[in-house]
Amino acid sequence: SPSSLQGPELHGWRPPVDCVRANELCAAESNCSSRYRTLRQCLAGRDRNTMLANKECQAALEVLQESPLYDCRCKRGMKKELQCLQIYWSIHLGLTEGEEFYEASPYEPVTSRLSDIFRLASIFSGTGADPVVSAKSNHCLDAAKACNLNDNCKKLRSSYISICNREISPTERCNRRKCHKALRQFFDRVPSEYTYRMLFCSCQDQACAERRRQTILPSCSYEDKEKPNCLDLRGVCRTDHLCRSRLADFHANCRASYQTVTSCPADNYQACLGSYAGMIGFDMTPNYVDSSPTGIVVSPWCSCRGSGNMEEECEKFLRDFTENPCLRNAIQAFGNGTDVNVSPKGPSFQATQAPRVEKTPSLPDDLSDSTSLGTSVITTCTSVQEQGLKANNSKELSMCFTELTTNIIPGSNKVIKPNSGPS
C-alpha cells in the first residue's frame, strides 16, 4: 500500500516532549537555563523587533531553538496544562513575526480517528439499535440520556447546567465566568463518546436542533447584549494562553484544506471536532447560530461590523467558522456515524507547525459547496415532560434539560459503525 501516504513528520528530528518536561530538562543544563532566563527577560514588556535588535536576546533564541523547549508540545487537559502553555508561548511568541492569522498549535497532534469514538459509543450505549432504523428517535435527547447513565458525565453536566442557569440578579443573567469554567471542566473531563454525541447529534427537525443549540446553555455561555467585533474578540482571546492555544488548535485541525478528500487537514475529523469542543468555555466559545436541523452553521458570538480596513481579515476569520467545509463535514459525518476511509497506511497525525504566510487557501469556487455530506440519519424530536428539575424560566431549557433525573435506558443511541472496506 502507498508508503507515501504516511503522515507527515513533526518539525525536525526530535520526538516532541511536553513543555513542562522540556523545561525541567532545560533547567538541568546551565547553558539552556541561563538562555531561557535571558529570553524571558527579553520578552517581558518589549515588542519582537526591539527584542531581536538585542544581540543577547538573539543569541538566547538561537540556542533555545536547539533545545527540547523549541519542539515541545502540550496535551489538552493535562495536569499542568496552563504551565505547559505558558512555557510554550514564552518561546513561540518570540519566534513569530507579530500577529499571525494562523498560529501553530501548542498541542500534540491527535492520532485517534472518529471510528474509535464510534466503537466506544456503541460499547457504552449497550444497545443494538441503529440510528438509521429508528426514525422516531431524537439523537440529541438520546445523547443526554446516555450521559445521565454515566456518573462522571451526569455529575459534570448537572454542575454546568445549574451554574449556567443560576440567575444572579434581574440585570445579571448568570455568572458567565463560572459557567465557562464548568463547561470547560465538562468538555475536558468527560470522554468524547458522550460530549460529541451531545454537541454533534444529527437532527431532522427544529426541536431537536434547538436542543443541540441549547447544549452549552447559550444564554449564559455564548450570547451577550451586543456582538463584539470578531478581531477584537480574537485579540482578547490571544491575551490568555489557554484561549490562544485552543484557537490555534482549532485553526490547525479545522482549517479548510484543498489537499484532502474531506477538506480537513490529514482527513482527521476527530481532530477538528476535538479542537472545536476545546474552544467551548472561553471567550471564543462557538455555537450553532440557529435551530436549523440541516443547515449547520456555527460561529463565535461576534460580527465584522466596525472592522474598518480590517473588514477582509475579519470576514476571513469568521468564515473559518461559518463557511468551513471541514467543520461542516466533520459535524455531519459524526451525526451520520461515518468516518473517512483512508488506507491502513494512511496518515495518523498532522504536523501543526505554523505556516509563515497569510493567504486564503486556494480553494476553487466549487469545492466548498460540493463537499458537504447529505445526512442519512432520520430523526424526530419528541416532547419531554418536566420531571423534577427545579423551576427555570426558559421554555427552551425545560425541553432541553429535563431528562437529567430520568434513568430510562436509551432505546436507540448506537452510532453506525463505518465500513471497513472501500465503498
Epitope: 507515501s4 489537499q259 486564503t360 466549487d366
Partner: antibody, heavy 119, light 112 residues
C-alpha cells in the same frame, strides 16, 4: 498491490465523445483523489482535473471545463473521464493518477489511454 | 495559473557524474498549512510518469537516495549525485499548492 487499470486505446471521429475508465485496486478508493492528466507529446503534461471519490466533488482546470466530465462508480472503484466534441487537438495519451496532495500529491499512475481523433 | 519553468531543457550526463535540474514557479508554493506541494516525476521512455519526490524533499519508497530534492518558496532543485543508466528519461516538477495544478515543461536527461 496498488493498481490503476485504464481502458484500451480509442480511435474516434471528430465531433464524437469518448469515455475512458480507470479501475482502482489495492487501496481505499474513497480515501484519495483521482486526477486526470493529458500528455500530447513528450515534455508536455496538463492537469485536467480531479474527482473526490469520498463525496463526488469535482474540480476542473478551467481550460478543460467544457471538454471533460469526471464521474465515478464507487461500487466498482472505477473513475471515468468523458471527453466531448473531439478534435485532433484532443489526440493524446490520458492518464488517471490517484493520491492526495496532503500525503504527497499523486502516488500511482495508470498505464495511459491513447486517444486518436481522426476522420 | 502558476507557471513552472524548468531548466535546462536537455541534460547530457556521463554515468557516475552528478546532475542538477532547476524548477522555478511564478508564485510561492508555500501553502497556508505550512507545506510546499512541489513534486518531481520521472517519465522513462514508453512508460507512465512515476513520482520520485513529494513535498519538495521527501523520497517515495523505492527511490534511491542518490536523488535529493531541495528548495523553498519559488526555487527548487532536483539533484542526482551519481547518474545511472536507469535514470534516463524526462523529469517534471509539478505544483499542487495553487489551483489549477501545473507542471514544468520537462527536462530530458540523456546519457553521454
Amino acid at each position: 498491490e496498488v493498481q490503476l487499470q485504464q481502458s484500451g486505446p480509442e480511435l474516434v471521429k471528430p465531433g464524437a465523445s469518448v469515455k475512458i475508465s480507470c479501475k482502482a485496486s489495492g487501496y481505499s478508493f474513497t480515501g484519495y483523489f483521482m486526477h486526470w492528466v493529458k500528455q500530447r507529446h513528450v515534455q508536455s503534461l496538463e492537469w485536467i482535473g480531479r474527482i473526490n471519490p469520498y463525496n463526488g466533488a469535482t474540480n476542473y482546470n478551467q481550460i478543460f471545463k467544457d471538454k471533460a466530465s469526471l464521474t465515478l462508480d464507487k461500487s466498482s472503484s472505477t473513475a471515468y473521464m468523458e471527453l466531448h466534441s473531439l478534435t485532433s487537438e484532443d489526440s493524446a495519451v490520458y492518464y488517471c493518477a490517484s493520491g492526495g496532495h496532503y500525503y504527497g500529491n499523486v502516488d500511482y499512475w495508470g498505464q495511459g489511454t491513447t486517444l486518436t481523433v481522426s476522420s | 495559473d502558476v507557471v513552472m519553468t524548468q531548466t535546462p531543457l536537455t541534460l547530457s550526463v556521463t554515468i557516475g557524474q552528478p546532475a542538477s535540474i532547476s524548477c522555478k514557479s511564478s508564485q510561492s508554493l508555500l501553502d497556508t498549512d505550512g507545506k510546499t506541494y512541489l513534486n518531481w516525476l520521472l517519465q522513462r521512455p514508453g512508460q507512465s510518469p512515476k513520482r520520485l519526490i513529494y513535498l519538495v524533499s521527501k523520497l517515495d519508497s523505492g527511490v534511491p537516495d542518490r536523488f535529493t530534492g531541495s528548495g523553498s518558496g519559488t526555487d527548487f532543485t532536483l539533484k542526482i549525485s551519481r547518474v545511472e543508466a536507469e535514470d534516463l528519461g524526462v523529469y517534471y516538477c509539478w505544483q499542487g499548492t495553487h489551483f489549477p495544478q501545473t507542471f514544468g515543461g520537462g527536462t530530458k536527461l540523456e546519457i553521454k
